[in-house]
């Protein structure tokens, strides 16, 4: 209370000071500063506590993006989009909310994390949980049987996220999917190639892509003695093996999910194995697994996949991992997940995974769920976990103490003397019309030092300085902010010179 009283007194005193300065006709700048102080004091005072106890914050699991964070985000998106386009993808967008019915029954145990919207005049709506189900709905609705598309948008999950590790309730997904009937494993191999290209381009550290197949998992569960009804729930337990020990997973399967201990042990013999194509070949020889039709199909496809991955030059980044059992219900074939690797403490130790940064797989049945006749459109795709990538890139830049430019301004139009506002406005307009990214300070007579300081702070490389003499001579003084070197450039050559210096193409094509 004493604090509030003190603030109230300060607001009163500051108000009197502002009034006094106005009466004395003090300088505009001083009045402006003191008014700004008054507003800051009032803001701290806020609404009367007795009237309102409102904490100004973003909702749980969400955040604002500062210009600096947005600059990082744009760079990451740029790498991803360029890769998607390089592989010939089109782009689509879908509504942020879907009919609740569209999302129901597609996510298994994760369905509880879907955000339902309050009644909006009859339609039961939910926020999209991912971009894959809306994509399948889009294909079915438009009767499309063939498309290669990417989609970058926000998705929503009622999770309890560890935001420090780059996990949120509202977050971006960057999806690439290939829909259509094609020869086995070619699109699947391209998806893995894309994943590796993006993760390599982003330079966020060494990574490994774990690969498995839903059919191998299902076949393995069948031969180990897991009933059909328990497949999905046992999958979600097995999928935890990258985070917890086999003992803990086994305890969950036996204790919580009612699996017989000997069945769990048989599963354990398989899911603790990982390797390359040699493991695929080894399992093709497994007397039990090779007798299961589903598992055999899956292993055959994986063998083919590894051939293509070798041709794409990425087989060294791929590990066949029998514990990979991605939680989503809709996967039907190959599944994969990219994890960043921590450097092991001692040589000879296995690299440690530090969380998934991309994932995907084949989902041949999802579109059929929306088609009245159940017509299937085979699909395979991937999703880049950009939020985690943003966090990693931000941390890396902070560690390197790198200054990130938050604007792309190439040149500041400045003046060295007073009364040149009109000339600055004319010149900046010329530059804009010529496609140059230009700014000026919003003051009639800014000090040259202030203008140069602004460039340093904003990372603007060039200053176009107008002066009385330059106007007479028909030139503009072009100054490099870093080298402080100045040259006179004929006004008609200025655009070309700026483009030359900033490496911009000379025509806006």
């Amino acid at each position: 209370m004493a604090e509030r009283a003190a603030l109230e007194e300060l607001v009163k005193l500051q108000g009197e000071r502002v009034r006094g300065l106005k009466q004395q006709k003090a300088s505009a700048e001083l009045i402006e500063e003191e008014v700004a102080k008054l507003l800051k004091l009032k803001a701290q005072l806020g609404p009367d506590e007795s009237k309102q106890k409102f904490v100004l914050k973003t909702p749980k699991g969400t955040r604002d993006y500062s210009p600096r964070q947005m600059a990082v985000r744009e760079k990451v998106f740029d790498v991803i989009i360029r890769c998607f386009k390089r592989h010939g993808a089109e782009v689509i967008d879908t509504p942020v909310f879907e009919l609740k019915e569209t999302l129901m029954g597609k996510y298994g145990e994760d369905s509880k994390l879907i955000y339902d919207l309050k009644d909006q005049g009859g339609e039961l709506l939910s926020l999209r949980y991912d971009l894959t189900v809306p994509f399948a709905r889009y294909l079915a609705m438009n009767k499309l049987t063939n498309i290669k598309r990417y989609h970058i948008a926000k998705v929503y999950r009622r999770d309890n996220p560890a935001m420090t590790r780059g996990r949120y309730r509202e977050f971006y997904q960057c999806d690439f999917d290939i829909a259509g009937n094609f020869d086995p494993m070619i699109p699947d191999a391209e998806c893995l190639k894309i994943m590796c290209e993006i993760l390599s381009s982003l330079q966020i550290g060494d990574f490994l892509v774990k690969v498995n197949d839903r059919r191998i998992l299902d076949g393995m569960f069948a031969i180990c003695g897991v009933s059909d009804s328990k497949f999905r729930t046992i999958c979600s337990s097995v999928d935890k093996l990258d985070k917890v020990s086999w003992e803990e997973v086994k305890n969950e399967m036996v204790g919580e999910k009612g699996l017989a201990p000997e069945v769990a042990d048989r599963i354990g013999d398989y899911v603790q194995q990982h390797g390359g194509v040699s493991l695929v070949e080894q399992l093709l020889q497994d007397p039990k697994l090779s007798q299961n039709k589903q598992a055999l199909e899956g292993l055959g496809d994986l063998k083919l996949l590894f051939e293509y991955l070798t041709l794409f030059g990425i087989d060294d980044k791929i590990s066949f991992d029998l514990s990979l059992a991605r939680g989503l219900d809709y996967y039907t074939g190959v599944i994969y997940e990219a994890v960043l690797l921590q450097t092991p403490a001692q040589a000879g130790e296995e690299p440690l995974g530090v969380g998934s940064v991309a994932a995907g797989g084949r989902y041949d049945g999802l579109v059929g769920m929306f088609d009245p006749k159940g017509r299937k459109v085979p699909c395979v795709g991937l999703s880049i976990g950009v939020e985690r990538i943003f966090s990693i890139v931000e941390q890396r830049l902070e560690a390197l103490e790198e200054k990130i430019r938050t604007t792309e301004t190439q040149v500041l139009v400045a003046s060295a003397q007073k009364k040149l506002l009109e000339e600055r406005l004319k010149l900046v307009s010329e530059l804009w019309d010529a496609g140059i990214k230009a700014e000026l300070l919003y003051k009639k007579n800014p000090k040259l030092l202030n203008q140069l300081q602004y460039c340093e702070e904003a990372g603007i490389p060039l200053v176009a300085i107008i002066g009385e003499q330059e106007l007479k001579d028909g030139v503009i003084k072009l100054r490099s902010v870093t080298s402080r070197e100045e040259v006179d450039v004929r006004r008609e050559d200025l655009v070309e010179e700026i483009k030359r210096r900033t490496g911009q193409p000379l025509c806006i094509c």
Epitope: L10, A36, K40, L41, E457
Partner: antibody, heavy 120, light 107 residues
């Protein structure tokens, strides 16, 4: 808790330059006006300069104007004082200080100070 | 520039005494005045702001009063830890100026 840690002081010859830094923590640095206050050995306190939260406003006492430059980097929670053309009378302990209630020119929090000695 | 004049420049007192230090501004500064305490080798510490507001954590034996040009700092009952140098400062207009200081010594 609020912490201000100055660095960059030392012995410099007349006419020389120094850059003082102040690392701030324990509060939202970008909300506060910040200042440099100095104290010559055995003497009183002198308010040297201040800078507004967004760096829009800066002021200097007459004796340092044109020689000293105050600046800040809100991304790094840091305040700086670039001191050029140093004179013997600039010898003092330089304190970095945080304004009261963000904008009131009363030093609520102070650093431990960094000693600047200007001598030939 | 506004001149701030403190009196006395030094004062000797005993534990339990009541001590008053005054500060005069060369022109009116409304209530824009603060009092600081400084011990040897340490940074100053804010005691009172806006003439009479006690900074949080400062013992209630310290109090301030005044407005316009004349201000006082009162310590109602001196404690051993109060022996230090005290400064007033005007926050009315830049350059913000301090008094020359009042050294409070043990009698």
């Amino acid at each position: 808790q609020v912490q201000l840690v100055e660095s960059g002081g030392g012995l410099v010859k007349p006419g020389g330059s120094l850059r003082l830094s102040c690392a701030a923590s324990g509060f939202t640095f970008s909300d506060y006006y910040m200042s440099w206050i100095r104290q010559a050995p055995g003497k009183g306190l002198e308010w040297v300069s201040y800078i507004s939260d967004s760096s829009r406003y800066t002021k200097y006492t007459d004796s340092v104007r044109g020689r000293f430059t105050i600046s800040r980097d809100n991304a790094k929670n840091s305040l700086y004082l670039q001191m050029n053309s140093l004179r013997a009378e600039d010898t003092a302990v330089y304190y970095c200080a945080r304004y009261l209630y963000q904008v009131i020119a009363i030093a609520k929090s102070w650093g431990q100070g960094t000693l600047v000695t200007v001598s030939s | 520039d506004i001149q701030m004049t403190q009196s006395p420049s030094s004062v000797s007192a005993s534990v339990g005494d009541r001590v008053t230090i005054t500060c005069r501004a060369s022109q009116g500064i409304s209530s824009w005045l603060a009092w600081f305490q400084q011990k040897p080798g340490k940074a100053p510490k804010l005691l009172i702001y806006v003439a009479s507001n006690l900074e949080s954590g400062v013992p209630s034996r310290f109090s301030g009063s005044g407005s316009g040009t004349d201000f006082t700092l009162t310590i109602s009952s001196l404690q051993p830890e109060d022996f230090a140098t005290y400064y007033c400062q005007q926050a009315n207009s830049f350059p913000y100026t301090f008094g020359q200081g009042t050294k409070l010594e043990i009698k």
